[in-house]
């Protein structure tokens, strides 16, 4: 049929609660595209209707929630203009928890479930949800060995849970928990996280490598929308945050009230050496005071800008 | 590495009880689940269940919920099963097992204690 | 629950003999929680194979496990003295966790 297939790694996921996937590969999926869910080569498509259990929603597949029997290997095609991209992805599902039972548990533990915290520094842990915009996500509650964390050491800041002052105890078996909305329905998400303690203040050199943007002016028309990605790649045992900045200052909080430039939500395609980070950023309406403005993609160490630039004037129009 | 200390034996009267304990070395003993196994004489070996520390949770085989209570001390690292109502059947070695995050299966074992159930 | 049945219950080898014992499952279980254990007269078990195929610790290459959905199986390459027990199969995907009723292996 024509279409190049793209192999990716394991998901191992939870059953009894939402998962979703979101088929983006860039460049592919930047720009006019059409994407169509498959599950184990069915040449019936994923359905699209939103009370469906399991559902495409955008060029997303939604389960709600994730059943044992969903364990397999699903396609996403893309299809631009001139191009067909087959994504693979195997998704497996185990049934229990661990703090309800060991039973049934984590058959094996992905890259996904660990996360580094350094001795001694402030350090943090993010919670991966990863949900298309039709799902809204409550607070965050995080837990670690079953218990849900206290103490002033410990803020939860969005999808982070801030640790102070890292110490030797704080290794262990953390969980973050939402409750996540969809059409009415209330679903609970609850991921686990390994997390170890490192001495070592990076990982053995490796800098997290934004590939887009790279220090550059981008010509935008006053008035319109623009969307611009971040792509990062990035060891897969990082604890790296990735966001947009303004004047030092995350976007978000910069325009906090009119909400008119925003941060994306954070998505990842894993590869087998690393994975591949997208997060973006809206300009909902440009303004003439986004000209000029270093807008920083943040990695890290690692940091890229674009600058909006009024495109030249085109002569040929008079 | 894990070092589980068990009673080499008990000796009790039929219709007595017993609690059995299970001694954790490291400091890993609240985050695993300990497991407690039977095996009677020159016979196979059969689950009991499972109890989580931290938080006190249990599983129990549906055979033993009337028979075994699993119990933990967190601050000496030991975890116990009451036997209650003992009869010769409940003669047997009786091992516990901790699971890991991760690793569910056995990968280490007590010794086990040997309970003889005997006027 | 799930009722693992092993077979042969016992058998004798010679040294130098390839072994293999089965372990049929009532139902289908993922091999991330079918695991074998050996055990010798008045010692505890020892985990042998972890999910199906994978060798513990301290384990000798002669052995090896494979299988999936209902069948699995263990083979031991090259009998050695050392390897008469008994070999129990074990699963630990639903609750409650059971064990094959046992191979007890003899020497021939």
């Known amino acids: 049929d024509g279409c190049k297939d793209i192999f990716m790694k394991n998901e191992i996921l939870s059953a009894s609660q939402p998962f979703a996937f979101n088929c983006t590969f860039p460049p592919i999926t930047s720009g006019e595209v059409s994407v169509t869910w498959y599950k184990n080569s069915s040449k019936i498509p994923v359905s699209k209707i939103i009370q469906s259990r399991i559902h495409q929603d955008e060029t997303w597949i939604l389960f709600l929630p994730m059943e044992w029997g969903d364990s397999g290997v699903y396609q996403c095609v893309i299809k631009g203009r001139d191009s067909c991209h087959r994504i693979h992805v195997n998704l497996t599902v185990f049934e229990k928890h661990w703090c309800d039972t060991s039973i049934g548990g984590l058959p094996n533990l992905s890259d996904e479930y660990k996360q580094i915290l350094h001795l001694g520094k402030d350090d943090s842990l993010t919670c991966h949800l990863h949900f298309p915009k039709s799902c809204v996500l409550g607070p965050i509650k995080w837990y670690k060995d079953c218990n849900e964390i206290k103490g002033e050491r410990f803020t939860v800041l969005e999808t982070r849970l801030l640790v102070s002052n890292v110490s030797a105890e704080d290794r262990g078996n953390y969980a973050c928990q939402a409750i996540l909305t969809h059409s009415g329905k209330q679903y609970e998400v609850l991921n686990g996280i390994t997390v170890s303690i490192t001495e070592r203040a990076g990982y053995g050199g490796s800098v997290p490598k934004i590939i887009y943007p790279k220090n550059h002016s981008i010509e935008v028309q006053l008035g319109t929308t623009l969307i611009v990605d971040c792509n990062v790649t990035d060891t897969k045992d990082n604890t790296n945050l990735r966001c947009w900045r303004v004047n030092n200052t995350l976007v978000d909080d910069y325009y906090d009230e009119s909400k008119r430039i925003r941060e994306g939500v954070e998505t990842h395609v894993s590869f087998r050496e690393h994975n591949l980070y997208t997060v973006n950023i809206t300009f909902l309406e440009v303004k003439m005071e986004d000209y000029g403005l270093p807008f920083m993609c943040h990695a890290g160490v690692s940091t890229a800008y674009i600058i909006l630039q009024l495109p030249a004037p085109d002569f040929r129009a008079y | 590495q894990v070092q589980l200390q068990q009673p080499g034996a008990e000796l009790v009267k039929p219709g007595a009880s017993v609690k059995l304990s299970c001694k954790a070395s490291g400091d890993t003993f609240t985050n695993q689940w300990m497991h407690w196994v039977k095996q009677r004489p020159g016979q196979g070996l059969e689950w009991i269940g499972e109890?989580?520390?931290?938080?006190?949770?249990?599983n129990y085989n549906e055979n033993f919920k009337s028979k075994a209570t699993l119990t933990v001390d967190k601050s000496s690292s030991a975890a116990y099963m009451q036997l209650s109502s003992l009869t010769s059947e409940d003669s047997a070695v009786y091992y516990c097992?901790?699971?890991?995050?991760?690793?569910?299966?056995?990968?280490?074992w007590g010794q086990g204690t040997l309970v003889t159930v005997s006027d | 629950e799930i009722v693992l049945t092993q077979s042969p219950t016992t058998m004798a080898a010679s040294p130098g003999e390839k072994i293999t014992i089965t372990c049929s499952a009532s139902s289908s279980i993922s091999s991330n929680y079918l695991h074998w254990y050996q055990q010798k007269p008045g010692f505890s078990p020892k985990l042998l194979i972890y999910?199906?195929?994978n060798l513990a610790s301290g384990v000798p290459a002669r052995f090896s496990g494979s299988g999936s959905g209902t069948s699995y199986s263990l083979t031991i390459g090259t009998m050695e003295a050392e390897d008469v027990a008994t070999y129990y199969c074990?699963?630990?995907?639903?609750?409650?966790?059971?064990f094959g009723a046992g191979t007890n292996l003899e020497l021939k």
């Open positions: 999910r199906t195929s």
């Open positions: 109890i989580f520390p931290n938080s006190g949770r249990t």
């Open positions: 074990q699963q630990g995907s639903s609750i409650p966790v059971t």
């Open positions: 097992a901790p699971v890991f995050y991760g690793a569910p299966w056995f990968a280490y």
